[in-house]
Amino acid sequence: QDCSAQCQCAAEAAPHCPAGVSLVLDGCGCCRVCAKQLGELCTERDPCDPHKGLFCDFGSPANRKIGVCTAKDGAPCVFGGSVYRSGESFQSSCKYQCTCLDGAVGCVPLCSMDVRLPSPDCPFPRRVKLPGKCCEEWVCDEPKDRTAVGPALAAYRLEDTFGPDPTMMRANCLVQTTEWSACSKTCGMGISTRVTNDNTFCRLEKQSRLCMVRPCEADLEENIKKGKKCIRTPKIAKPVKFELSGCTSVKTYRAKFCGVCTDGRCCTPHRTTTLPVEFKCPDGEIMKKNMMFIKTCACHYNCPGDNDIFESLYYRKMYGDMA
């Protein structure tokens, strides 16, 4: 390729590349161009995406004009039940563009993560999911005395309106977090979840933690004292190590568990806290997981029915969680 001529670029400004496509210098080191992707035609002037391990395969050494972007040998990826070649890009959903690179999947958001600050034209901006739209969009809650096209001439006083509690706002985000759900298992290791937007971009996210209401192997009914029908929080004689998928907690824990009743009532966690627990796996890998620790249990008749899809609210929620 002859690069002796003076650099001449198609546009003054660098082009805007689609999400997940790298902006690279052309073969002459002159102009910034959008890199060609896996399977696309390439030339020395239009290079392949180096960040995805792609190279321009010209086939025979004699042909140095046009090639095809090919992946350097790398491990494929399994994602959402599909197999992708190394260097291959795909849309995991309407919100994310992903790329497989040597066994690892990296994704970039297709939806704007923009933040909107209040202004006279939009005093209470909110992000909402609109029907038929993939990405959330900004909407402005209009005060009653606004004109059809812009701010009203009469000074509209923000302090005279009722909005969200300003102490709960973080950079225009009304922080909301649901209660933790009930543990997915009545005995043994399960999962408890909640939804929150308590993060940098005020985005709803699902959080999960491990939970164990009681060990499965414990025969707790034996410990119920004569004349009593329940054992709410049985004493666990010795500290325990938790197990998760063949991995064992590094530390031992004197954890509280919930007991059982003989009169049809069930005992579930009432007040809980969340703490990180480190697990060591046979291959030496250490993984850290958040786990529920029980402070108090409650015994009640609001037990989940076998076919009841609307499990009782009491059973579904964890109250008074500290974290």
């Epitope: 909107r116 600050l117 202004s119 006279p120 059809a148 812009g150 701010p151 001439l153 923000l158």
Partner: antibody
Framework: EVTLKESGPVLVKPTETLTLTCTVS????????VHWIRQPPGKALEWLAV???????DYNAAFMSRLTISKDTSKSQVVLTMTNMDPVDTATYYC????????WGQGTTVTVSS | ETVVTQEPSLTVSPGGTVTLTCRSS?????????ANWVQQKPGQAFRGLIG???NRAPWTPARFSGSLLGGKAALTLSGVQPEDEAEYYC?????????FGGGTKLTVLG
Amino acid sequence: EVTLKESGPVLVKPTETLTLTCTVSGFSLSTFGVHWIRQPPGKALEWLAVIWRRGGTDYNAAFMSRLTISKDTSKSQVVLTMTNMDPVDTATYYCARDGGFDYWGQGTTVTVSS
Amino acid sequence: ETVVTQEPSLTVSPGGTVTLTCRSSIGAVTTSNYANWVQQKPGQAFRGLIGGTSNRAPWTPARFSGSLLGGKAALTLSGVQPEDEAEYYCALWYSTHYVFGGGTKLTVLG
């Protein structure tokens, strides 16, 4: 990525009309308004006009008779015209997004001289 | 004509706290003035730091806070860093138009 870019003539003659274009990307003009602001050499910022997300407009009273702001949402462009230019209008002209003036263009320098 | 006044210049030591203010010539600044604070570092573009009196932009560090103090809009920098040296402008909304202040040149000693 949110960007705003001003374009227009570098030099205009006194009494001529200045037309500046602000081309935006990364957001929609139906969702955010756009402001025009200028800064004469060595001086402070001076707010000129705004076109709101729903098409309404507001102007600096000192320039109201000379300014017109409009937008083409489909082209993601906001246009400001300023008539009867004078050497005192020599300045760097900026467009900025509504909502805390969070994003600004790099500015375009306009010199008014015969 | 409404005038918005800022301190022309302020000097602060690294790690110190400084408050920039924005005064309106026609009375106390309120939340309906939607006070905005804009920063320009030498050789860089302008960017908004605070909007609607006290709301930080996503890139604005937590050491910057906007508020109303004694009838004025205020921008407080706590634990000032050398990179905070810049020109700061406030802008106030008056029902039909914005007015920018004259700007404050913040110098960080060091």
